[in-house]
Interface confidence: low
């Protein structure tokens, strides 16, 4: 039995190419250290986008990634995808494992469904 | 108020099992994981294991491996410890134990298992 | 397994007398994720064990603030600074750092 993983199901990302949104866990089970991975599904394939680990000391994660960001607080992780592009549309999954204390813990989220328009090119001035 | 109520002292003869309760009460019972502490007579203390009473996921101590198996009752809030093919030197006080950001934040009162013929 | 030795097996002191109670790990319990899982625990006679410390320097809850906690990698200390009556009894160390975990021998603290 794994621990529940929650993430909303549709989210639109910005203008700038930003998709934000949270992803939480439960129980809590006062976890000392949680690594969280961003998987992105497509057809039957799963790609690790990036991948963290938060401790009570570390609550900003994905230093190594700059396209990802992230802020761990207790049972929930906000994270924030930048440099998207209309071609990663796609479903990205939210997987959870909770390292210390032990007995180990994994959960994945049902994913959500990233939907990224580009930006229309300004037309041309006159001026 | 969070607290372990543990069972009765046990006479046993050697070669027999026994298994002994942790009744918690004042918290959520599958949100914390639960410790078993051995302590011989005048002597110090050792971990067991822990077990996840969420999902009954158990992390060992090598040497109790075989000797010591863990199980919950979630509808009861109660977690259980086994003891095989008892010997003398199984004989101690063990204490539950759980966790809140320290390994034994809180204990059970212990049970006394007696191992003679 | 990690040993966690407390040379000192039976300590005594005076009322009102600070008190140094010492912890050496046989490795460093420093924890992959940056924590050391160092826990100090108090057992009267008759009694289960209670929590002083955690994480090498964190009292518990209504643990008086005489008690602290020091030290890093493989020596840790745990102070008294005035020894009231009630503080009397075994003092445990114990690592949560690697399994198996494990507890020091004990601090014996009485009254001189």
């Known amino acids: 039995e794994a621990i529940q993983v929650t993430q909303p199901s549709v989210v639109l990302a910005s203008s700038h190419g930003v998709a934000s949104f949270p992803c939480e866990y439960s129980p809590s089970h006062n976890t000392d250290e949680v690594r969280v991975t961003v998987l992105r599904q497509t057809n039957d394939q799963m790609t690790e986008v990036c991948a963290t680990t938060f401790t009570e000391k570390n609550t900003v994660g994905f230093l190594d990634y700059p396209f990802c960001s992230g802020t761990f607080n207790e049972s929930r992780v906000n994270l924030t995808i930048q440099g998207l592009r209309a071609v990663d549309t796609g479903l990205y999954l939210c997987k959870v494992e909770l390292m210390y204390p032990p007995p180990y813990f994994v959960g994945m989220g049902n994913g959500t469904q990233i939907y990224v328009i580009d930006p229309e090119p300004c037309p041309d001035s006159d001026f | 108020e969070a607290k372990l109520q543990e069972s009765g002292p046990v006479l046993v003869k050697p070669g027999a099992s026994v298994k002994m309760s942790c009744k918690a009460s004042g918290y959520t019972f599958t949100d914390y994981y639960m410790n078993w502490v051995k302590q011989s007579h005048g002597k110090s203390l050792e971990w067991i294991g822990v077990?996840?009473?969420?999902?009954?996921?158990?992390s060992y101590n090598q040497k109790f491996k075989g000797k010591a198996t863990l199980t919950v009752d979630k509808s009861s809030s109660t977690a259980y410890m086994e003891l095989n093919s008892l010997t003398s030197e199984d004989s101690a006080v063990y204490y539950c134990?759980?966790?809140?950001?320290?390994?034994?934040?809180?204990w059970g009162q212990g049970t006394l298992i007696t191992v003679s013929t | 397994d990690i040993v966690m030795t407390q040379t000192t097996l039976s300590l005594p002191v005076s009322l009102g007398d600070q008190a140094s109670i010492s912890c050496r790990s046989s490795?460093?319990?420093?924890?992959?994720?940056?924590?050391?899982?160092l826990e100090w625990y108090l057992q009267k006679p008759g009694q289960s064990p209670k929590l002083l410390i955690y994480k090498v320097s964190n009292r518990f809850s209504g643990v008086p603030d005489r008690f602290s906690g020091s030290g890093s990698g493989t020596d840790f200390t745990l102070k008294i600074s005035r020894v009231e009556a009630e503080d009397l009894g075994v003092y445990y160390c114990?690592?949560?750092?690697?399994?198996?975990?494990?507890f020091g021998g004990g601090t014996k603290l009485e009254i001189k």
């Open positions: 077990i996840n009473p969420y999902n009954g996921d158990t």
């Open positions: 114990f690592q949560g750092s690697h399994v198996p975990y494990t």
């Open positions: 134990a759980r966790y809140y950001g320290s390994w034994f934040a809180y």
């Open positions: 490795q460093s319990i420093v924890h992959s994720n940056g924590n050391t899982y």
